[in-house]
């Protein structure tokens, strides 16, 4: 089930998924001056089973000026380049997909992809928040949001994060002081689709990753 809305916006913060649930789609978008080639895909789709998940399809971009020049297909992990992002650039440490069953890791970049990635999340997806450069995190609880299904409608939980304007950068989970335990979440309903175990696995997984801020847009 696709999440109807985007994750909540927190002033002076960005969010990122550490892993993507099966069913997540990523649009194949190209940067200005480039277009999707006809033999390239419309989207990538996270598929798999309990033991292995991966992204189906390839995104490919070509110059809008030329009709027959195709650009590099989705590279293999060892060919990954540093991601060009809107705000900051930071290398990403690959995560073993098997470390979180039923999830795909961040897809590697493709040449001339758009600056912002358009993901379509599914129910159960968790995203983590981080204050942007120049702002410091004040936590009341976990700096995360989960897409849940409640009474037939999807909604994102509210992350317990405030970013204050002090010149200090906070990190994604695992790179700062431990946050409140998942039991401490101010959630009243019992329809949560992400279990404590899921949270623990994702937090442990997040701890293995370097800071990586991608500005992501949703449609």
């Amino acid at each position: 089930e696709l999440c109807d809305d985007d994750p909540p916006e927190i002033p002076h913060a960005t969010f990122k998924a550490m892993a993507y649930k099966e069913g997540t789609m990523l649009n194949c978008e190209c940067k200005r001056g480039f277009r999707r080639i006809k033999s390239g895909s419309l989207y990538m789709l996270c598929t798999g089973n309990s033991s292995h998940s991966s992204w189906d399809n390839q995104c490919q971009c070509t110059s809008s000026a030329t009709r027959n020049t195709t650009k590099q297909v989705t590279p293999q992990p060892e060919e990954q380049k540093e991601r060009k992002t809107t705000e900051m650039q930071s290398p990403m440490q690959p995560v073993d997909q098997a470390s979180l069953p039923g999830h795909c890791r961040e897809p590697p970049p493709w040449e001339n992809e758009a600056t912002e990635r358009i993901y379509h999340f599914v129910v159960g997806q968790m995203v983590y928040y981080q204050c942007v450069q120049g702002y410091r995190a004040l936590h009341r609880g976990p700096a995360e949001s989960v897409c849940k299904m409640t009474h037939g409608k999807t909604r994102w939980t509210q992350p317990q994060l405030i970013c204050t304007g002090e010149m200090e950068t906070s990190q994604f989970p695992g790179e700062e002081k431990p946050q409140a335990s998942p039991e401490g979440r101010p959630e009243s309903e019992t329809s949560c689709l992400v279990t404590t175990t899921d949270f623990q696995i994702q937090t442990e997984m997040a701890a293995t990753m370097e800071t990586s801020i991608f500005t992501t847009e949703y449609q």
């Epitope: 033999s39 895909s41 789709l45 089973n49 189906d56 399809n57 297909v73």
Partner: antibody
């Protein structure tokens, strides 16, 4: 250019079986999920089945689940649809498709006595 | 399953006319929709993807719009080659589902 060519259609008796093939070229077949879609005579389109690039994930329409099997041979760039226990309502033109912009010409399956 | 309700099912129009075909999804599909064209006795051609993006090589008289659960395909200044069947398909979730189709006929 992407090319998809279906084959294997024909006249089948009710209760019989048939295996359709779709030969793909012009793209890296082994990295793309693939679909089978059908169109009954003078009717609209009906999605039949999907298989992920590495065959780890398959989805079927309720009407064919348990009777149809989608599979693929990546080294041979070929997609398959094995159909068993065929019924008259399975009569249709069967198309293979790759994320909706690229379709084959179709192969006609007629289930009749 | 997501139900795609396409309208009209058929329409008689004249060369040069502008026509709009709509598809309503039973739930939001976040622009995960393709518009297809099928000419008599032929296969399918993708015209619009992600709701609004024109496929390379498709004439600019075709355009797509919409968001949430409601989407439309507009063909301005109809040409003779545009008389065909048109379908929408959603790829937001499995099972993939199609609109019932619209037949464009010459008046």
């Amino acid at each position: 250019d992407v090319q998809l060519v279906e084959s294997g259609g024909g006249l089948v008796q009710p209760g019989g079986s048939r295996k359709l093939s779709c030969a793909a070229s012009g793209f890296t077949f082994s990295t793309f999920g693939m679909h089978w879609v059908r169109q009954a005579p003078e009717k609209g389109l009906e999605w039949v089945a999907y298989i992920s690039s590495g065959s780890s994930t398959v989805y079927y329409a309720d009407r064919v689940r348990g009777r149809f099997t989608i599979s693929r041979d990546n080294p041979k760039n070929t997609l398959f649809l094995e159909m068993t226990s065929l019924r008259s309502e399975d009569t249709a033109m069967y198309y293979c498709a790759r994320d909706w912009m690229n379709w084959g010409q179709g192969t006609l399956v007629t289930v009749s006595t | 399953d997501i139900l795609m309700t396409q309208s009209p099912s058929s329409m008689s129009v004249s060369l040069g006319d502008t026509v709009t075909i709509t598809c309503h999804a039973s739930q939001g599909i976040r622009s995960n929709i393709v518009w297809l064209q099928q000419k008599p006795g032929k296969s399918f051609k993708g015209l619009i993807y992600h709701g609004t993006n024109l496929e390379d090589g498709v004439p600019s008289r075709f355009s797509g719009s919409g968001s949430g659960a409601d989407y439309s395909l507009t063909i301005s200044s109809l040409e003779s080659e545009d008389f065909a069947d048109y379908y929408c398909v959603q790829y937001a979730q499995f099972p993939r589902t199609f609109g019932g189709g619209t037949k464009l006929e010459i008046k």
